[in-house]
Structures are given as structure tokens and as C-alpha cells.
Amino acid sequence: LNTTVLQGMAGQSLRVSCTYDALKHWGRRKAWCRQLGEEGPCQRVVSTHGVWLLAFLKKRNGSTVIADDTLAGTVTITLKNLQAGDAGLYQCQSLRGREAEVLQKVLVEVLEDPLDDQDAGDLWVPEESSSFEGAQVEHSTSRNQETSFPPTS
């Protein structure tokens, strides 16, 4: 699966859009998780509304917000007030029961605000208006079309 690299400025908001086949993923909730290490588990950060019909409503966990346009097939995640500690590898997931299918892998990079090193005076930008989608760099790997369910305990 391709990895998309997104860069955001510290203190601002970073918006991530993951697209998917709306029919294939009909009725499925979506989630945003943070990968713990290269091969480690993906720790759930936030998921869409429990009632799939209400997936368009924004759901928040701390500074992360998720909303799903199930007709268009786009799930949008917003990382607000981006901090250096938010940098890392994330996944957009489609949930089929407890099975999570990876829709997209996203590498978030946080750029230091150059204003941090100078006296910015009273200059500030309202958080809501400073959304940054960043440059995308894709690392290609082949997608295995035939997968078996992982063993469950």
C-alpha cells in the first residue's frame, strides 16, 4: 500500500483526506490510528460515529477530529494544533466488525514554525483557518489482493 507523506506546520491544523470505494465500504465505520513502530500495532486515535448513518458528524478525540462522507467515499481527519510529538506513521482504516482494512498509510511530518525563533509580536493565525494539506510523496509497494483473516484468540 502506498504511503502518503504530509507536512504540517507546528501550531497549525493538518487535514488528511483518505478516499475509498463508497460501495465496497458501505456500512463500515472508519478509523484513524497511529502505527507504533515499523511492525507494531496501530493504536486507535479516533473513529467515526457508532451509527453509520451519522458518520458525517465530526467526532473528536483530543485534538484529532474525524468525519466521513460515505456517499463521496472520503474520510477526513484533522489534526489540530499540530505538535512535534504528532509526527509519525498513521493509517486510515475501514472497520468491518473488528477487522480493520487499511485504506491509506500516512506519514505525518511536523515543520517547526519559523516565527518561533523570532519575536512574532502580536501576529497569530486563527487555528480554524490554518489548515494545511501538504505535499504528497508516495512510496509504492504492491497490494496483496488475496488476504486471509488473521487468527483471533
Epitope: 468491518r96 473488528r98 483473516f149
Partner: antibody, heavy 122, light 108 residues
Framework: EVQLVQSGAEVKKPGESLKISCKGS????????IGWVRQMPGKGLEWMGI????????RYSPSFQGQVTISADKSISTAYLQWSSLKASDTAMYYC???????????????WGQGTMVTVSS | EIVLTQSPGTLSLSPGERATLSCRAS???????LAWYQQKPGQAPRLLIY???SRATGIPDRFSGSGSGTDFTLTISRLEPEDFAVYYC?????????FGGGTKVEIK
């Protein structure tokens, strides 16, 4: 009318190959996942695997992984279940079924084929 | 994998009586992913209930589903002659999806 029509009964010898089919009609075949379910004589239902005809994304139950191959040809709205080397224990009724996703995220097989009886005997 | 245990294995009742079928899961199952099917001899299964309690299209209201967690129930309020069949529960919550062993409802 929404329906799934399966190919006819088959009698095969152990070691032979086989491909059975399931043709969908009355709906957009690429809009729903299609599953395969096995029912051995006098027994219950077993979930084998599922395919999304739109892109042929396929999932298998661990019990059937490597034993069968599920495929689809969206141009003719048909899903397939195949064996490269049949065993006597493959004797069973095989059903294809359409998976419906309902408004609240529920999943269930809402439309079933009539079944294909596969008999493997020397 | 999640094991679904249905009980009783066979239920002997007369037309007009109430039938209560149980489906117990080896671990918790989300209600959204629990379905019930009816199968008559020589026929394919038919969807009765999805989401633990929602009736499928064309299913009479004498069929109802309930339950959550590990215990689910299918109730047929008044048995009609055509209701004598085998009933299966199925979960889609955990991979791989699994079916219960079935409950046969037979005429007493």
C-alpha cells in the same frame, strides 16, 4: 428480480479440478460482496470466503485458505469457486450469497443462490 | 474465532405455540453483526433478522430478534406450519465470520 443463479450439480473423482459459478442479476453486481458458504451433508453452514467483484479483493476463512480459490468476472456478473485437486471430503452443497450492508452498518447475506451440489467419489 | 452455540438442538412444538431459540457467543459480539437465517430441507438459507433485531424485507412480524453481548434470541411468537425448519445464527463481528450449529424446530 434480484437473484443469484448457480451452476449445476457436479460429480467428480478425487484429484480432479472444478470451477463452479454464481451469476448475479437484477442489481449492480459490483456493488456488493459475494460470499461462499459450504454445507456438508446433514451438517451446518460454514463461511468459506468473500469477494468484492468491483476489484476482486478476496478474503478467506483460515479453514479454506489454500484449499479453494474465489474469483469473479465483473464483465459477466459472475463469481467463481474453484478447486485444483478435489478430495472426498469436499463433497457438499456450496452456496453463494450476496452480502448486504444496511443503513446502520449491519452486515448479512440477504440473497442466496440455489446451491451447487458437489460430489467427489472414486 | 468466535464459536456460536445454539440451543436447544431440536425444539418440538405445535403450530400456534411460541418458539424461543438461543444463540450464545464465546465472546462478545456487536449487535450490528448478528444475523438469523431459516433453512428448509432442500432449500437455500433465507435471511430473517440482521443487526440482531431488524427484520429483513418480507419477513413476517411474528419473527423477532433480541439480545446483546454474548446472548441473542430469536423468537417466533406463533408458529405457522411453514416455520418448521432449521434456524442458524451468524456473526460478522470477528474474523472469520461464523455460523451457529443450528436449531431444528420440528412439529410435535
Amino acid at each position: 428480480e434480484v437473484q443469484l443463479v448457480q451452476s449445476g450439480a457436479e460429480v467428480k473423482k478425487p484429484g480432479e479440478s472444478l470451477k463452479i459459478s454464481c451469476k448475479g442479476s437484477g442489481y449492480s453486481f459490483t456493488s456488493n460482496w459475494i460470499g461462499w458458504v459450504r454445507q456438508m451433508p446433514g451438517k451446518g453452514l460454514e463461511w468459506m470466503g468473500i469477494i468484492y467483484p468491483g476489484d476482486s479483493d478476496t478474503r478467506y476463512s483460515p479453514s479454506f485458505q489454500g484449499q479453494v480459490t474465489i474469483s469473479a468476472d465483473k464483465s459477466i456478473s459472475t463469481a467463481y469457486l474453484q478447486w485444483s485437486s478435489l478430495k472426498a471430503s469436499d463433497t457438499a452443497m456450496y452456496y453463494c450469497a450476496r452480502e448486504a450492508g444496511y443503513d446502520y452498518g449491519e452486515l448479512a447475506f440477504d440473497i442466496w443462490g440455489q446451491g451447487t451440489m458437489v460430489t467427489v467419489s472414486s | 474465532e468466535i464459536v456460536l452455540t445454539q440451543s436447544p438442538g431440536t425444539l418440538s412444538l405445535s403450530p400456534g405455540e411460541r418458539a424461543t431459540l438461543s444463540c450464545r457467543a464465546s465472546q462478545s459480539v456487536s449487535s450490528s453483526y448478528l444475523a438469523w437465517y431459516q433453512q428448509k430441507p432442500g432449500q437455500a438459507p433465507r435471511l430473517l433478522i440482521y443487526g440482531a433485531s431488524s427484520r429483513a424485507t418480507g419477513i413476517p412480524d411474528r419473527f423477532s430478534g433480541s439480545g446483546s453481548g454474548t446472548d441473542f434470541t430469536l423468537t417466533i411468537s406463533r408458529l405457522e406450519p411453514e416455520d418448521f425448519a432449521v434456524y442458524y445464527c451468524q456473526q460478522h463481528d470477528s474474523s472469520p465470520p461464523t455460523f451457529g450449529g443450528g436449531t431444528k424446530v420440528e412439529i410435535k
